[in-house]
Amino acid sequence: AGVFELQIHSFGPGPGPGAPRSPCSARLPCRLFFRVCLKPGLSEEAAESPCALGAALSARGPVYTEQPGAPAPDLPLPDGLLQVPFRDAWPGTFSFIIETWREELGDQIGGPAWSLLARVAGRRRLAAGGPWARDIQRAGAWELRFSYRARCEPPAVGTACTRLCRPRSAPSRCGPGLRPCAPLEDECEAPLVCRAGCSPEHGFCEQPGECRCLEGWTGPLCTVPVSTSSCLSPRGPSSATTGCLVPGPGPCDGNPCANGGSCSETPRSFECTCPRGFYGLRCEVSGVTCADGPCFNGGLCVGGADPDSAYICHCPPGFQGSNCEKRVDRCSLQPCRNGGLCLDLGHALRCRCRAGFAGPRCEHDLDDCAGRACANGGTCVEGGGAHRCSCALGFGGRDCRERADPCAARPCAHGGRCYAHFSGLVCACAPGYMGARCEFPVHPDGASALPAA
């Protein structure tokens, strides 16, 4: 058992021309969230088993509103990792699909609207317990930068999280620096130490002292990107400067970019500009193909005829979308208006309306004065998303249909007595007070304390 962890570093327009506009606008603020789906990489049943290793959904990111005229920046991301727990062995090779979703927060009827912005997929080799692996993927004009790792949950250990190690009651049986390992009580296990200098980012080991490279890296310590080498022969010891005696191959020599990508040198390494349909650090990832298992929910994947559609998913009943990601039922057509909840009763659909709405489709706005009659001369007043009747004197209730007791609210101040009257109420004031509601004290000299004009 263990956890696959995905950290999204950035999502925004990729380099090069055709950079997309921000997915949010001043009129339609939005926020991002991510979904990751994992499948065993070489599993034959991967096509039929959607997200067989698990899936996770991120939290929603901060709300973003486009600044008019500003270039589309990297978009604000949700906090935290996406974590996909796995119960069985970590397969070592896995396929992933990472989707970037946009939640529009405009005035959609029925709440926010979701749309898929980008989807990337790939197959990777990864040992559990190894360091974070970094990746860059492009989907159309968007670029997603992320890191991922798989780690075992105690007591599981090993590159597949299949061995169980737990402290024993008598750990002294093992020498210093060693720990006892179950299921064999008499076996002592050394903490795994890779070859000295093995790259913590690009290498890992399954046996002590070895250094195995993650995909895309080579060299004894996994520090050399595939197809590149920094120098053929170093300068002699007398040389004060570093560099190459014979101009060695530059980072682009031998073109590390696959699938017709073009290479350009950068201060630290190289960068590939990929042809349409390919992306990744070395253009090694083709769009998404059936090999990536992109069809969810048991969809059948068929290779597409042209580069723009590398695959087509034939969805099983009840699902649709380019990757069979959308559950389709009779409520999918959104028969309920104004945010009503659709319930499929089998023989019919029913709408459960939000407060303030009614009708079979929640189409009637109860908070709307249109067509709303206030009885007994009352007038309808809208405000705050609700309506109310402002009733004529002597009437009350939601629709002014109830005869009001004008004295119920004790309107006469300073102990005045209230009498209901056909035109409203009359206050009989206590000695020393006057006014329609007995609100003004009468001074001993006979003057009243009326407010100044």
């Epitope: 029925g110 009943p317 009840g318 999918s332 959104q334 023989h347 659909l349």
Partner: antibody
Framework: EVQLVQSGAEVKKPGASVKVSCKAS????????MNWVRQAPGQRLEWIGI????????IYNHKFKGRATLTVDKSANTAYMELSSLRSEDTAVYYC?????????????WGQGTTVTVSS | DIQMTQSPSSLSASVGDRVTITCHAS??????MGWLQQKPGKAPKGLIY???NLEDGVPSRFSGSGSGADYTLTISSLQPEDFATYYC?????????FGGGTKVEIK
């Protein structure tokens, strides 16, 4: 009286697109979904897709995915079905048919049909 | 997709006969099906919804029954205007699917 009146017959070349209209009257247009169904000569009826005229939400038969587009003009009480990349096997009579959006009545009223002929 | 298998594909009957047409769905559809009538050169017309309910204006000689995956349309006493092709349709699940039709001809 409920009526669905469709546009006239069309003759198109392979690869072209066709847009068929269906004007509704006699009921509240946005209270009923609009289905589109076709019938090729001597063949069974085939469902293309459905649209909720109130919200514009659509669901398509995966067989027509990417080729059929359903839209509505609420102000004109009219539904449209556009089929692109026409092939000879798209030669058929195309029908619109309304369906109650809640009680799920089967398609009770149908348009008179629009014959689309695809021929080079 | 749910397959709708209709039988017979055609039948000959006389005015006054009792006619039964059956439709079998490849999986249970909980009554979410209907029957349509189509005359040559005309659009289909709804007859029955939810397996057993008559659409407005449909004569009571038409009736529907069934549950699960098996449904029946019965015309108790065939009239001259009933000679047509009848289709079943399921709307339990997208995509909606139709039976192959039963042509009712005059004997």
């Amino acid at each position: 009286e409920v009526q669905l009146v469709q546009s006239g017959a069309e003759v198109k070349k392979p690869g072209a697109s066709v847009k068929v209209s269906c004007k509704a009257s006699g009921y509240t247009f946005t209270d009923y979904y609009m289905n589109w169904v076709r019938q090729a000569p001597g063949q069974r009826l085939e469902w293309i897709g459905i649209i909720n005229p109130y919200s514009g939400v659509t669901i398509y038969n995966h067989k027509f995915k990417g080729r059929a587009t359903l839209t509505v003009d609420k102000s004109a009480n009219t539904a449209y079905m556009e089929l692109s990349s026409l092939r000879s096997e798209d030669t058929a009579v195309y029908y619109c048919a309304r369906q109650d959006s809640l009680l799920d009545y089967a398609m009770d009223y149908w348009g008179q049909g629009t014959t689309v002929t695809v021929s080079s | 997709d749910i397959q709708m298998t209709q039988s017979p594909s055609s039948l000959s009957a006389s005015v006054g006969d009792r006619v039964t047409i059956t439709c079998h769905a490849s999986q249970g559809i909980s009554g979410n099906m209907g029957w349509l009538q189509q005359k040559p050169g005309k659009a289909p017309k709804g007859l029955i919804y939810h397996g057993a309910n008559l659409e407005d204006g449909v004569p009571s000689r038409f009736s529907g029954s069934g549950s699960g995956a098996d449904y029946t349309l019965t015309i108790s006493s065939l009239q001259p205007e009933d000679f047509a092709t009848y289709y079943c349709v399921q709307y339990a699940q997208f995509p909606y699917t139709f039976g192959g039709g039963t042509k009712v001809e005059i004997k």
